[in-house]
């Protein structure tokens, strides 16, 4: 028998520095977790102790903190090189700055193979990107060889900016011939490493003949066997065992997100490459693991540029940006409108001629807006200003919801109106009218939404049985502020870009902003 140790990360999202337990900015260092310096300590410890070790990343290193805003992926290549990753799969967020924003900082600089079997380049891009990413890579590990085959969510064109010259094929259809090829070349130990979410990971384990292990990402899935060491609630045991259609037991793993854990899986193979056993658990990278001094010193060196960036002007406002709780928790506020407009703008994707855009709606809990911005400071808006407005380090995500769920959400928005509670919704692409004289749960008297399948966008009444795409904070997608109906009833959830980054990009693009209160949210009394 031959034993392989797979160390894996996924959805790190720019968390190069250690973070608090909830993966936001580290405040009390003695209680902080993760970060590449701490990760390196643990990886090196395992590399020294065990003979056959692979360090893999399942995508979405890009996007999530000011590190990515400033360094645009150069930081990913630099620190992943320093940690000596063995391979990485492309995630959807690796395309956030377009194909050029992937090629130049990461694909050309990475000293490890970057993989995806289901992304095919066409047109002029085909020769430009040739060889910069691969469908698979065969790695020598100890006295054996291991094949690693990559995959990426086929929803990427709706979630990011890969452009028109990359085709995202069905994962299973694309993976099977690559695995078959490796088998014919006597590679009998094959890991599928990719970024399509836990449901697809399980399908790959079930359907792709010859895949021995699946290491996934995208859904931020936390798996654990035994008592979990922190706040994350396991979605299943680690590894999650799937019985394949040809009767094999295939371990599937994922390691939550944000570099908080290092996935640790030990696989035992027989001489024919069959998995005999698999066991392990994610390792919580808490403060009991010291940060590696040389990596930490490098982080501190790179950090200097970030501090300078946060005080630079992004753009100007010529109006007061009302982010006060007195406004945003009670009525339409122009800060809410600005943020929602930025959220929609960030998700402009012309992927179908029938649609002017794939999504037109935004909802945002008023309690998530934490500060106004005064225009009387020469109108200047900085990253620092935006960090005061959106201090929680969240993301603006894409969900699919039925109309009936949206109606419930808007009822929840005003179910205890008047108490300055955070659930009051700010909106974009939505016109809502409330009648507060009615009883809670029956206060939404009009709810019109902006069409997407139209050449001239207009507002139509919400249809209860129709499925709508909505951009919202991850806080709401996870049921925060009492929006349990969103969490329970959402049909799809894809994590998006860092909240501050979305707004800062929009302001930089617009240069001068003047958001108004324009009747998106109205109140009426009596008959309608």
């Amino acid at each position: 028998a031959w034993e392989l140790t797979i160390l894996h990360t996924n959805d790190v999202h720019s968390r190069l520095e250690q973070t608090s337990e909830d993966s936001s900015k580290c405040v009390n260092a003695s209680r902080c977790m993760g970060g590449v310096a701490r990760l390196f300590t643990k990886v090196q410890q395992i590399r020294r102790a065990e003979p056959n070790v692979l360090l893999l990343d399942a995508g979405d290193q890009y996007q999530g903190t000011i590190w990515f805003t400033v360094y645009k992926g150069a930081e990913v290549a630099h620190f992943m090189n320093a940690l000596r990753y063995d391979a990485m799969a492309l995630g959807n967020h690796e395309f956030d700055n377009g194909v050029e924003g992937l090629i130049e900082p990461l694909l050309k600089e990475a000293k490890f193979p970057i993989l995806s079997a289901n992304i095919k380049a066409k047109g002029p891009l085909a020769s430009q990107i040739s060889g910069l990413y691969l469908p698979y890579k065969v790695l020598p590990v100890g006295d054996e060889v291991v094949g690693i085959v990559g995959y990426t969510s086929k929803e990427t064109p709706f979630l990011s900016n890969p452009g028109t010259n990359l085709v995202f094929e069905d994962e299973i259809t694309a993976l099977q011939p690559e695995v078959d090829k490796l088998k014919t070349l006597n590679v009998n130990k094959i890991i599928a490493l990719g970024h399509s979410g836990f449901e697809m990971d399980k399908l790959i384990a079930q359907k792709v003949r010859g895949v021995d292990v699946v290491v996934g990402g995208h859904s931020n899935t936390f798996l654990y066997t035994g008592n979990p060491p922190s706040k994350e609630v396991p979605a299943g045991k680690y590894p999650f065992i799937v019985t394949s259609d040809d009767g094999r037991k295939v371990p599937v793993v994922q390691a939550y997100a944000f570099g908080k854990y290092l996935g640790y899986l030990k696989i035992e193979f027989d001489e024919r490459g069959n998995v005999i056993s698999s066991h392990g658990n994610p390792i919580l990278l808490n403060s009991s693991i010291p940060e590696d001094p040389s990596i930490k010193a490098d982080i501190n060196k790179w950090r200097i540029k970030l501090d300078n960036y946060s005080t630079q002007e992004l753009g100007k406002t010529i109006v007061y940006l009302d982010g006060s709780s007195q406004s945003c928790r009670f009525r339409e506020c122009n800060m809410g409108n600005l943020i929602c407009d930025a959220m929609i703008n960030n998700n402009l994707r012309h992927t179908d001629e029938m649609f002017w855009n794939h999504v037109s709606m935004c909802i945002l809990n008023g309690g998530g807006i934490r500060s106004p911005i005064d225009e009387r400071n020469n109108g200047t808006i900085t990253w620092e200003n935006l960090a005061a407005v959106l201090p929680f380090g969240g993301t603006f995500d894409l969900v699919q919801l039925k109309g009936s769920t949206l109606k419930k959400a808007f009822e929840h928005s005003v179910h205890r109106y008047g108490q300055s509670t955070g659930e009051f919704l700010q909106v974009g692409g939505i016109h809502v009218v409330y009648d507060l004289s009615r009883k809670p749960g029956d206060r939404v008297v009009k709810l019109d939404v902006l069409c997407t399948k139209c050449r001239v966008p207009s507002y139509d009444p919400l249809k209860m049985d129709e499925v709508y795409k909505v951009i919202l904070p991850n806080f709401l997608a996870n049921g925060g502020d009492g929006f349990q109906m969103i969490k329970d009833e959402l049909l799809r959830h894809d994590s998006g870009d860092q909240d501050i980054n979305v707004v800062s990009t929009y302001i930089s693009k617009m240069k001068v902003i003047y958001p108004a209160v324009e009747g998106r949210i109205k109140f009426s009394t009596g008959s309608h």
């Epitope: 590399r47 003979p51 056959n52 000596r84 000293k111 490890f112 193979p113 040739s130 060889g131 910069l132 691969l134 469908p135 698979y136 890579k137 065969v138 020598p140 590990v141 100890g142 006295d143 054996e144 060889v145 090829k181 490796l182 070349l185 006597n186 590679v187």
Partner: antibody, heavy 118, light 107 residues
Framework: QVQLLQSAAEVRKPGASVKVSCKAS????????MDWVRQAPGQGLEWMGD????????IYNQKFKGRVTMTTDTSRRTAYMELRSLRSDDTAVYYC???????????WGQGTTVTVSS | DIQMTQSPSFLSASVGDRVTITCKAS??????LSWYQQKPGKAPKLLIY???RLIDGVPSRFSGSGSGTEFTLTISSLQPEDFATYYC?????????FGGGTKLEIK
Amino acid sequence: QVQLLQSAAEVRKPGASVKVSCKASGYTFTDSNMDWVRQAPGQGLEWMGDINPNNGGTIYNQKFKGRVTMTTDTSRRTAYMELRSLRSDDTAVYYCARTNWDYAMDYWGQGTTVTVSS
Amino acid sequence: DIQMTQSPSFLSASVGDRVTITCKASQDINSQLSWYQQKPGKAPKLLIYRANRLIDGVPSRFSGSGSGTEFTLTISSLQPEDFATYYCQQYDVFPRTFGGGTKLEIK
């Protein structure tokens, strides 16, 4: 700068063994695999195998399996290739070559001539 | 094993010429191809890896292209120091295999 310094030329009789050494400098020895390649007189290049200095893991060309052993001594930053049961057609220049992150051979030793003759 | 077929085996050219050497793999090698230059009595020198990535310090007149099974090494304007033997090698799978070589001679 990266340098690979190989041992001097050797002459062996058929059936004997030879052990060629390759001393590395200018980089972290355990960060890269070492390959061995040979070239018979007037012929092309032939890959023999690969060793990971970190853990001693080896992958050999089946053609040489059972006759070749590759080892490393990390304290001496040296790789070794031993070939046993030598035949006259093993007469060749033997090269060690460091592999880069992509496993292409980016730095080569100067070569060690091994002559097998009765 | 994957067979690598290089052509031509011999090539006569003059200084300033543009020359192309081709390398065919018996099956798709996933862009895992390198090109080496070897001068008489010397060790091979890596010029290009991953089919088209030029090694630092190698003159830009050298370029690599191709994918799948067909690859080319192009020297845009031959210099006197370029007369040598060139080898392609696949490192997609084990065992690594080399092409038979192309000897580039002065016309």
